[in-house]
Structure formats: structure tokens, C-alpha cells
Interface confidence: low
Amino acid sequence: KPSNEATGNVSHSGMKKEFLHELKAENIKKFLYNFTRTPHLAGTQNNFELAKQIHDQWKEFGLDLVELSHYDVLLSYPNKTHPNYISIINEDGNEIFKTSLSEQPPPGYENISDVVPPYSAFSPQGTPEGDLVYVNYARTEDFFKLEREMKISCSGKIVIARYGKVFRGNMVKNAQLAGAKGMILYSDPADYFVPAVKSYPDGWNLPGGGVQRGNVLNLNGAGDPLTPGYPANEHAYRHELTNAVGLPSIPVHPIGYDDAQKLLEHMGGPAPPDSSWKGGLKVPYNVGPGFAGNFSTQKVKMHIHSYTKVTRIYNVIGTLKGALEPDRYVILGGHRDAWVFGGIDPQSGAAVVHEIVRSFGTLKKKGRRPRRTILFASWDAEEFGLLGSTEWAEEHSRLLQERGVAYINADSSIEGNYTLRVDCTPLMYSLVYNLTKELQSPDEGFEGKSLYDSWKEKSPSPEFIGMPRISKLGSGNDFEVFFQRLGIASGRARYTKNWKTNKVSSYPLYHSVYETYELVVKFYDPTFKYHLTVAQVRGAMVFELANSIVLPFDCQSYAVALKKYADTIYNISMKHPQEMKAYMISFDSLFSAVNNFTDVASKFNQRLQELDKSNPILLRIMNDQLMYLERAFIDPLGLPGRPFYRHIIYAPSSHNKYAGESFPGIYDALFDISSKVNASKAWNEVKRQISIATFTVQAAAETLREVA
């Protein structure tokens, strides 16, 4: 096809300006309003209706093809006729305190009937009764402190932990491993209440009755618990529930800090080990087990009646066909399902995606197609374990691994209004730096300055002077399957808070009923200028990835990152110098492979400068080398015990799904190695993991060599 079909004779930069200029804050605001009128819990009629609406609107916006893609996956709901709660019972078995069954609805939402009460999705049913143990954030190190230093056993106890620091599924896993028979999760004011800010509806803080919903799975990338590795379609073989992946084995329930106060105020046992175990409630934060003094005969009882159910979910998939390279896919995806109204999570992201689709559609209607195909996705059931995106990627994995250029994630656009936050593959570092230099900063005091300028000042890189921070990809969002399983270059961007002055874990109203449209309009982004900036960043990333003649990937940034990660893991290992020597552990091979990668990447970039871009075959060859570089870090065997985490350079931390870990195979082999019973076996596994990492880096380097 003639190249003018791709651009309508408008230059790349002119077309990009037109695309960015078409993005309007007022539209994003309007879309956010529309998407937050009712709850959109996965598997419910409301969320199906919204899928149909988005489907119809994307067609109107001008996409070539829009389809609903459905799967039947395992979801979890509270029992309407048998509510979940926690009680304190006296020695006669009488309930003397019960936690709230629901949150008070926010003003204006009193008559909305389908607000799901707070619950921990996928908790099993059960009514455990016993003594309480306070376990801080329920991190690995918190249980080490309890069990190893304080000699307190959680076996047969109900543990209570404060949300924050790590993914709640990891908290539950740790509690199970410690032998707990039930777990209570609560939001402590120290983590979800910023001093001097009012509670909702008068401010953006969490009120005492507010509760964070969320799933407590440990899927490790499996997707639907009943169909790991394969799409949950009508042909799927489904495991029995007893063999489902990642389900917790103990009842779990979340509460707010008003209810937590009642459970914690009479705790007995030793005082908290240090100030890092003390929250913001007026309670002693004694560890337990059990209550003190006159209250020692009282017990805590959980009443959990939630159920799991195979339920139909719906993704919306929109296609804008590429004019010149229709077999190369750039994907922009974000979820649509919400715990309740989703004012921030996810609809602040979905509204931005909607406006990006509208802008691309406007260009297409003028005859200006992208060079490559763009796929837009509205994912379902993200909140239940990234299910919609994972099932779709499982169904289309063969196409994606052959044709997937990049995946840009688009969940919540804001978690604050201070500065930009970006997590991405090193391949995208220079892309992000370059495009933020071309965008206006929305921040006060940076009028007339670029987004790059405000970002680097407010969030400087810890390694590279004069550059902004870009973080590693972890998980907990829909890029997981694309990056960690399939090895498709991925990135995400949103506006965030000032982490130096604002110590709260997430934004305080995260996953509560108070996460409303009004929260955003009144307190976070009244003019929607931050939403617009995020739309410009996400949109420009997609635009460049879909339209640049040479893919905007920088393999030399990967080389720099690999060197840093190799240094880091070597330093961790060197905390055990005697064992390193005794078991002959050497990182020389890994450093050699990294040096080789650096050399090959440099030569590749040199050839790229000299490339005759008018030769479509040579151009495609080098673009394919760039596209497939991320794929080269995938090990088909996966990481130990985590077959769907296959990226050797990055994986979600085994201790916190949200965080990214570099050289995760080596890191996990080294973790807590000094307490392993069989030291020889443990250090042998370190050696094996070093060899896997070495091979992988070396093999990836080979893909960048001249093809013949």
C-alpha cells in the first residue's frame, strides 16, 4: 500500500501534534462521570452493560473492529443472605462486639443497591475462633521477628495485620505458612490517614468505617485459578476447586480502623518490638496472643460465608489496523471492573483510554492510520487476579509472542497529584524521557516548563544524576501476562503523590466505597489537568510505538540496567563470603555475559544509525531484533515454583507481588539462605540460578548480533 495511507501526507511529528491536541481534559472528565454512576463489579450485569457501552462507543469513535471477548472464570462473592463479620465473644459464647457489615454510603449514593460489602475475595468459608496475634504488616520479616526473635507462635491463632507495604495476598500466604487459622486485615490511620487532611466526604482521607476490598490470591501469574495456562473458554478443562491455583486456605476478612480499635485495644502479650510496629490508633499494639487481664477469657470469632462461582466476564477488544505493518501489534489496555464505583481505580484510567481511542479514531477518520496495528483493551476481572487480560493473552499467546511489539498499561491515572510515576522495561527509558521533554508540565511552579523538568526535580533517579526515576515493573496489574509471561516490552505511567512527605501506602480511599467521581473532582484533579497529562504520556507512548519507522527501543539502556542488577545481586551474595568461597560460587560468568551484551548492544546501535530506512526488509530485520529482545529474556521453564513468571531479568517479588525484583531466580535462591538446613543444596541452587541468568543474558545478546 502507498505510504500516504498511513499518514494522509501529514508528517510523523505533525500527526503526533494533531493526536495530542485532540486529547481534551473535559472529555476525560465526562467519561469518568459516565463510568462511575454505578458499581461495576466483575461478573455483574452492570459491568456487562458498561462493556457493551464501551464496545458501541469505540465503534462510533472509528475503530475498525470491536469485539467482546468472554471467559468463564472463578470469581468470589459475599453471601447476600449470610453477611461476613468478626465478633468478640465472651466465655459463654455470647457476642459482645460485631464488626460492621457494610460501609456507610457516601453522600448522593445512599440509594444505590448493588454496593458489594467489604470482603476478601477468594477467602474460604469458615468460622474460626481463638486468640488474636498482631503481626504488623504480615511481611516475611514481620513473621521472622515474631517467630525467631520474640518466640511467639501464630499456630492455631487468628492473626490481625495492617494493610500496607506489600500485596495482601502475600500477607495471607505468610500467615498460612505461620500456621494461623484465620486472618483479619485492617487499614491503620498511620498508613491510610494523612495528618491535617479531613476524612471523606470533607477530604481525601479514609474514615473510620472505610474498608479496603481486594483479592487474597497467590496466583503467580496463572490467571483463572481453574484453567492455569489455558483460556477459560467453553472447551477448557477445569480443575476441581481443591486443585485450583492460588486460593487461600484460611478465612480472611478486611475491616476499618474503627472496628480494629475494638479488636486491638485490650490486646495482651508483649509490647511491640519497636516503633515500626506501632500504628496510629490509641492502642498499645501489644502482640498477643489474646487479650489482657479481665478480657483474657474473650475470644475473637470470624464468620465468613463468601462463595466462589464460575462466572462470565467480558473484555472489550478494539482494533485499529496498521497501514504498513498490520502484523505488528501495539497494545493499550486497562481494566474496567471496579470494587465499587472505581472513581480512581480503574475508571480514571478507563476514561483516559476512552479519550485516547477517540483521538486515534478521529485521525483514522481523516485517513491517518497508524503504521502498526493498535489494539485497545478494556479488561474485566482485574481485581480478581488479572483474569480478563490473562485469559485473553492465553487465548492469543501464539499471535502475541510473534507479533507483540509493546503493551502499555492504563489502570488508575492518578494516585496523587504531585508528579509523574513510570515503571517500564529499560527498552522504553529513552522513549519516555524524550516524549516527556515535549510535553508541558501541569505542575504549579513549572509553567512553561516541560513535564520532564518537573518530573526530574520532584522524583530524581537514585542512580543517574539529572534524570527522573523510572522503576522496575512488578505485578498487581494487567501488564503481568504480557511482560512476565510472554516477554512483550511493557510500561505504565500515572500521576503520583510525594512519597517523601506522604507516607500512606496507597491513596487512602483505595478500594473503598468512597472512591467516587466526587473524590477526584473535589480533591485530586478539579481541572483534570493531571488526567490530561497522563493521557498525553500514555497516548504518546502508544503513538510512537505504533508510528516510529524504527521502533523507539534502546537496547543500550538494557545493558546499563543489566550491569546494575548484576552488581546488586553480587553484593547480596557477598554478605556470605565464607560460603561463597566454600561452595565455589562465582559471578564471573554473569558479569562476562553482561559485558558481552553491552558490547553487542553498542554495535547494534551503531548499525541502526547506518540503516537504510527506505529498505523495508533491512528495516523489518532490525525492528524485529528490537521487538524480540524482550522475548529473549524469557525462559520457557519459568522460575522455580512459578512457571508463569518466565522473565529471567524481572519478576514480581516472592514477598510482595507489587514490587519488581531483578535476577529473581538468584535473589530467591539467596533469600534467607543462612537458615537453610541443607546449606550445600541451597548454595548449589544459587550456582544453578547464576548459570541460568548467564545463559539467558548471553542468548539475548546473540539476538542483537548482525543476522548473517
Epitope: T38, Q45, N46, Q53, K80, T81, D114
Partner: antibody
Amino acid sequence: QVQLQESGPGLVKPSETLSLTCTVSGASFSSSGYYWGWIRQTPGRGLEWIGTMFYSGATYYNPSLKSRLTLYMDTSKQEFSLRLTSVTAADTAVYYCARHRGPDSGLDAFDLWGQGTLVTVSS
Amino acid sequence: DVVMTQSPATLSLSPGERATLSCRASQSVSSYLAWYQQKPGQAPRLLIYGASTRATGIPARFSGSGSGTEFTLTISSLQSEDFAVYYCQQYNNWPPLTFGGGTKLEIK
């Protein structure tokens, strides 16, 4: 405002198939979020729920009628319909169509009804 | 199936009196219960849902109470237009949705 109107033959012969249609005006199937049901009333058995469907195609049938019953919908015409096969005199009743909120709601009562149509099964 | 039993089958009262109608479920239906009014030649009309919440446009003299298996519809001061047949219906456990046999409220 939203209105429901049943239509179909008033007389059906035994062993034949009873077909009724309910036309919805004033609301869209695909945006309202309601479920659409059929209920019948006989002097002997009182009110009896027949079945319900959602515009996604999800159907819920009374187990006592399931083997003979089909519900289907034409969203373009804003109609939903009932087919009951192998009818007998016991199927003589006033048939109502009605809307309700569906199984994931705590408000699942029939808040709007058609005026009803009498169907007699007789040779 | 959940069987709904209404009592009495017929209730004879005068205008201005208080009417109390009962509905019993064969097993707990929580508060997922509705009440309907039906006049001759008309379709049923929703009065109460959720055991105690009045539907739109229903006068305050109608009230519902109860949960679990025992429910009551009360009409505080009967008006002439209130004489009709009243049905209860459960929607806790379905399919099937089930109705009571009805209580006929007639003028004494």
C-alpha cells in the same frame, strides 16, 4: 415511561406450542440492567413464575417447566418471548410479562408488569 | 423450592381499621421478600421489597416487617381502594421465584 405489552394467541390447542411476546417501550434492554420475566396466574395455582432472561442471553427457568420452555429475546425489536411446548389444559392462565432486577441485586422484586393476556388451552 | 404460605386466606375488615397480613417461608429467605397488591382484572402491583422498603409511590400506611421466615404486611388505616388480594414473594433462593397463595382483603 416504561411499559410492557403482552401479545399472542388467546387460544391454543392441546399438545401444540404456546408462543407469547412482550414488547418493551420506553427503556432499552441493553442499558437498563433489568431482567425480564414471565409469570402466569390460574385460579387453582395462584401466581407462578415461569422464567426470566437478561439481554446477555442468560436465562433462568422454573424447574417445573424447564423441559418445555424456551425464552428468547430480540433486542433490535425490544421484544422478549416465551415458547411453551406440549401444552395441556393445565397451562390455561393469564400470562404476564414483568421486569425485575436480577439475581445479583437485593431488590429483585417485579416492579413493573404488563396488563396480562389470557391464554386458553382447549380443542 | 421455598414454599410461601399466607394467612389468613380471607380477611374481612372495615375502612379505617388496621389490617395485618402474614406470610411464612418454609426456610429462611433473609429479608428478600416482596408484597404485591392485585385488584380484579389488573396485574399485580409492587408494594414492598426487601421486606420493609416501600416501592415508589406507595402510601405510608403500607408497611412491611420481618426477616427469616416470618413476615407481616400492615395497612395502618384501610381506605376503600385497599380492598384487594395481596401476595408475598421470595427472591432469596431461586430459581424458582415463589409466591404465596394470597390473602383476600374484603370489606366487612
